[in-house]
């Protein structure tokens, strides 16, 4: 059997609300990923599992399951999403995100990606885990591999 | 130099309604939060409301929901509360106060205070 | 809501002498490193000034006899030394959640 080829694309989009009494960020964030079949056969994405992480704590989880079929040579764009919470002992971080005199509210989370595949019964696990810069204080989309080596601002104090 | 001017002392009747600006000036209006306190005579301060300029986002005080409307207007730098159907219990000076700021991050506290503004509620 | 209990209502401090004024809240109002907690004065006739911002860091232009500490629910206020000029009425205000609450005032007196 030849290479089933995982890459991770980079953050699409990132959707930000907050619960202002608890000081709370909700980020919606959607990932792409090329996945490429280089066998004569089909192989079958079964399930991928991301994680993403602020400052070394997992902030969200997500599993997405029986997802597509990948035809001999061929390669599929998938996107998925990850709704992550910043919230309790991060909560700081809401000073930083609605902060208004400045207009992009970097933060620097690491995405962490497992894709399963099966072919004829056997299966096979790819993963991937890369940093991203996501903007924490509003709704933004990206251009593919956009959000990957930005100057990050950092909160402190 | 920050400054935060209000509008003059107000005497209204018992049911009427009362517009307040906040003109300010020597910073950009937009990149700080507004609010407004209440002030009973020699009483302790109540926080209102609290507004992102940007937007208009207000962040109410539940007490106040109902009685206090906050708006913007960027045009003018410039932020009013309106108060309506007062009673006597709205008799006290409301003051605007700028949301303070470290370069990258929030402290709530507030860092310029307007100078008042009287609101007197009577028949 | 978070209650503020400040206290003492009043007090007299002598010329030169250590003002301690104490607040504390119902609640925590930490989180992580950060304390929501400011202090301010307020002078008959004037708007209230801030004096101290998130627990124990001086406002510019705030001359330094003024600090705070605490974290979690307890917090002080210490003027020293008590100048003239410091009579007045001093609150504390946490912005941990909405609402926003005030302490009740504590008014200090130069004896």
């Known amino acids: 059997p030849r290479s089933i080829d995982v890459k991770y694309i980079g953050v699409k989009s990132a959707y930000v609300s907050y619960d202002v009494q608890k000081r709370t960020i909700y980020l919606n964030i959607t990932n792409t990923l090329n996945i490429t079949n280089n066998n004569y056969y089909s192989v079958e994405v079964e399930n991928i599992t991301a994680q993403v992480q602020f400052s070394k704590t997992v902030i969200g989880k997500a599993r997405l399951n029986n997802i597509t079929i990948i035809g001999p040579l061929d390669m599929k764009q998938i996107d998925y999403t990850v709704p992550t919470v910043i919230a309790e002992e991060m909560s700081y971080m809401y000073d930083f995100c609605t902060l208004i005199s400045i207009k992009v509210h970097n933060i620097v989370l690491m995405m962490q990606v497992t894709v399963t595949t099966t072919y004829f019964g056997h299966s096979e696990q790819i993963s991937q885990e890369r940093y991203q810069y996501v903007d924490c204080g509003r709704n933004t989309t990206y251009q593919l591999g956009q959000s990957e080596y930005l100057n990050v601002l950092q909160p402190q104090q | 130099e920050v400054r935060l001017q209000q509008s003059g002392p107000e005497l209204v009747k018992p049911g009427a309604s009362v517009k307040i600006s906040c003109k300010t000036s020597g910073y950009t209006f937009t990149d700080y939060y507004m609010n407004w306190v209440k002030q009973s005579h020699g009483k302790s301060l109540e926080w209102i409301v609290n507004?992102?300029?940007?937007?208009?986002?207000?962040f109410y005080n539940q007490k106040f929901k109902g009685k206090a409307t906050l708006t913007v207007d960027k045009s003018s730098n410039t932020a009013y509360l309106d108060l309506r159907s007062l009673t006597s219990e709205d008799s006290a000076v409301y003051y605007c106060?700028?949301?303070?700021?470290?370069?990258?991050?929030?402290?709530?506290?507030?860092?310029?205070w307007g100078q008042g503004t009287s609101v007197t509620v009577s028949s | 809501d978070i209650v503020l209990a400040q206290s003492p209502a009043s007090l007299a401090v002598s010329l030169g002498q250590r003002a301690t004024i104490s607040c504390r809240a119902s609640k925590s109002v930490s989180i992580s490193v950060y304390t929501y907690v400011h202090w301010y004065q307020q002078k008959p006739g004037q708007p209230p000034k801030l004096l101290i911002y998130?627990?124990?860091n001086l406002e510019s232009g705030v001359p330094a006899r003024f600090s705070g500490s605490g974290s979690g629910t307890d917090f002080t206020l210490n003027i020293h030394p008590v100048e003239e000029e410091d009579a007045a009425t001093y609150y504390c205000?946490?912005?941990?959640?909405?609402?926003?609450?005030f302490g009740g005032g504590t008014k200090l007196e130069i004896k």
């Open positions: 998130l627990a124990s």
């Open positions: 507004i992102n300029p940007n937007n208009g986002d207000a």
């Open positions: 205000q946490h912005s941990r959640e909405l609402p926003y609450t």
């Open positions: 106060a700028r949301e303070g700021q470290l370069r990258l991050r929030r402290v709530y506290a507030m860092d310029y």
